[in-house]
C-alpha cells in the first residue's frame, strides 16, 4: 500500500503543458486541465470556456463550465482548470441552507435592533439587540476551509490512506 | 458495452477463506481503477477495496484492512478479492465496480450483477 | 469516517409528482469549487447505478427528470416527475474522505 502519486513524482515528459493539446496518462490518470480518452492511452486537453478539470483524473469527459444565472455576476471565467465563479449581484445573498438562489438582503434592521454587518453576496445584513447585542441573523458562514487531506490540491491527487 | 461478471461466491465458515474474481470487458481495463462493494442483505453498501490501474496503490476501510487483499491481473482483464479470516458480518453480495477516480478514488460508474458471499457455521 | 444521514428512509409519491431526497454529511464535503458527493439508484434484484456525480453532474443515458444540488454538507437528489420505473432505493456517496461512506438509503415508492 502506497500513497498516490504528487505531480512531483512525475518525469518532467509526463507533466501535461498547457498548450499540450494531448499527452499521456500517468498511472492511468490525467492532470488537471484534461480527461482520458477512450482507449486510455492519451489525456486529452479540456475545451476553455466549456468544460474543465480541477483534479487528477480518469474522466472520459471534463466536466462542464457552471453557467452563472441571472441575478449572479461572474467573478472569475471557467479555464482548463477551474470551474466559473458566480456571486450573486450587489443587495443580494447566498445562503448556506439554500445555495442554489441569491435572496434579497433585508433593507433595515427590526425595531429595538441596529445593524451591526452589511449585506454581502454571501450573508444577509447582521443585526443585534441594542441592549443585549445578541445576533438576530445567523453567523456568517465560514470562507470554504482549504483542506489538504483527500480530495487534494488541484496540483497533486492525493491519497485515501490504504 | 463494459461487462463486469463476478464469481467465486459461495458458502464459507467463519475464519474460512474465499476468492472472488471478476472478468471484465468492454472498456480498456489496464487504464482504470477498480473496486469492490457489498451489501449485506436487506442493508445498505460498503466499500470494501480499490485498486489503481497499475496495481501498486491500494486502498481499503478499517473494517476489512490485514483481512482482504485486492489484486488484478491486466493481462486477463481481471481483479480478485482475497478474503481470509471471513465473519458472519462479512455475508454480503459483493460488486465488482469501475471506479472513477477525481482528486481521489470518487464515484462507482459501473456495477456487476454481484456475487453472493454467506459466512456461517 | 464522514458519516451521511439520509432523508426520508421511505417516501411514498404520486405519479408525476415531484419526489425529494436529502444527503447530509457530518461535516462538509467540498473543496475547490466541487462538492464530492454522488448518487445511486437501486432497483429491486439489481446492482446499484450511478445517477449523479460531483452533487450535480448527470450521468450519461440518465434522464433529465433527475437531478442534484446542494453543497458543504446538504445535498438533494430531485425525481421532478415521478414514474413508475422510478421505484427503487436511492443512495448518496461521499468521496471527500477515506474510507469513502454511503448515506442509507431512501425507499422511493408510488402512493
Known amino acids: 500500500e502506497s500513497a498516490l502519486i504528487t505531480q512531483q513524482d512525475l518525469a518532467p515528459q509526463q507533466r501535461a503543458a498547457p498548450q499540450q493539446k494531448r499527452s499521456s496518462p500517468s498511472e492511468g490518470l490525467c492532470p488537471p486541465g484534461h480527461h482520458i480518452s477512450e482507449d486510455g492511452r492519451d489525456c486529452i486537453s479540456c475545451k476553455y470556456g466549456q468544460d474543465y478539470s480541477t483534479h487528477w483524473n480518469d474522466l472520459l469527459f471534463c466536466l462542464r463550465c457552471t453557467r452563472c444565472d441571472s441575478g449572479e455576476v461572474e467573478l472569475s471565467p471557467c479555464t482548463t482548470t477551474r470551474n466559473t465563479v458566480c456571486q450573486c449581484e450587489e443587495g443580494t445573498f447566498r445562503e448556506e441552507d439554500s445555495p442554489e438562489m441569491c435572496r434579497k438582503c433585508r433593507t433595515g434592521c427590526p425595531r429595538g435592533m441596529v445593524k451591526v454587518g452589511d449585506c454581502t453576496p454571501w450573508s444577509d445584513i447582521e443585526c443585534v439587540h441594542k441592549e443585549s447585542g445578541t445576533k438576530h441573523s445567523g453567523e456568517v458562514p465560514a470562507v470554504e476551509e482549504t483542506v489538504t487531506s483527500s480530495p487534494g490540491t488541484p496540483a497533486s491527487p492525493c491519497s485515501l490512506s490504504g | 458495452e463494459v461487462q463486469l461478471v463476478e464469481s467465486g461466491g459461495g458458502l464459507v465458515q467463519p475464519g474460512g477463506s474465499l476468492r472472488l474474481s471478476c472478468a471484465a470487458s468492454g472498456l480498456p481495463f489496464n487504464s482504470y481503477y477498480m473496486s469492490w462493494v457489498r451489501q449485506a442483505p436487506g442493508k445498505g453498501l460498503e466499500w470494501v477495496a480499490a485498486?489503481?490501474?497499475?496495481?501498486?496503490?491500494?486502498h481499503y476501510p478499517d473494517t476489512v484492512k490485514g483481512r482482504f487483499t485486492i489484486s488484478r491481473d491486466n493481462a486477463k482483464n481481471s481483479l480478485y478479492l482475497q478474503m481470509n479470516s471471513l465473519r458472519a458480518e462479512d455475508t454480503a453480495v459483493y460488486y465488482c465496480?469501475?471506479?472513477?477516480?477525481?482528486?481521489?478514488?470518487?464515484?462507482?460508474?459501473?456495477w456487476g450483477q454481484g456475487t453472493l458471499v454467506t459466512v456461517s457455521s | 469516517d464522514i458519516v451521511l444521514t439520509q432523508s426520508p428512509d421511505s417516501l411514498a409519491v404520486s405519479l408525476g409528482e415531484r419526489a425529494t431526497i436529502n444527503c447530509r454529511a457530518s461535516e462538509s464535503v467540498d473543496i475547490y469549487g466541487n462538492s464530492f458527493m454522488h448518487w445511486y439508484q437501486q432497483k429491486p434484484g439489481q446492482p446499484p447505478k450511478l445517477l449523479i456525480y460531483?452533487?450535480?453532474n448527470l450521468e450519461s443515458g440518465v434522464p433529465d427528470r433527475f437531478s442534484g444540488s446542494g453543497s458543504r454538507t446538504d445535498f438533494t437528489l430531485t425525481i421532478s416527475s415521478l414514474q413508475a420505473e422510478d421505484v427503487a432505493v436511492y443512495y448518496c456517496?461521499?468521496?471527500?474522505?477515506?474510507?469513502?461512506?454511503f448515506g442509507g438509503g431512501t425507499k422511493v415508492e408510488i402512493k
Open positions: 460531483l452533487s450535480s
Open positions: 456517496q461521499q468521496s471527500y474522505e477515506d474510507p469513502l461512506t
Open positions: 485498486i489503481n490501474s497499475n496495481g501498486g496503490r491500494i
Open positions: 465496480t469501475r471506479l472513477t477516480y477525481y482528486g481521489n478514488p470518487a464515484w462507482f460508474a459501473y
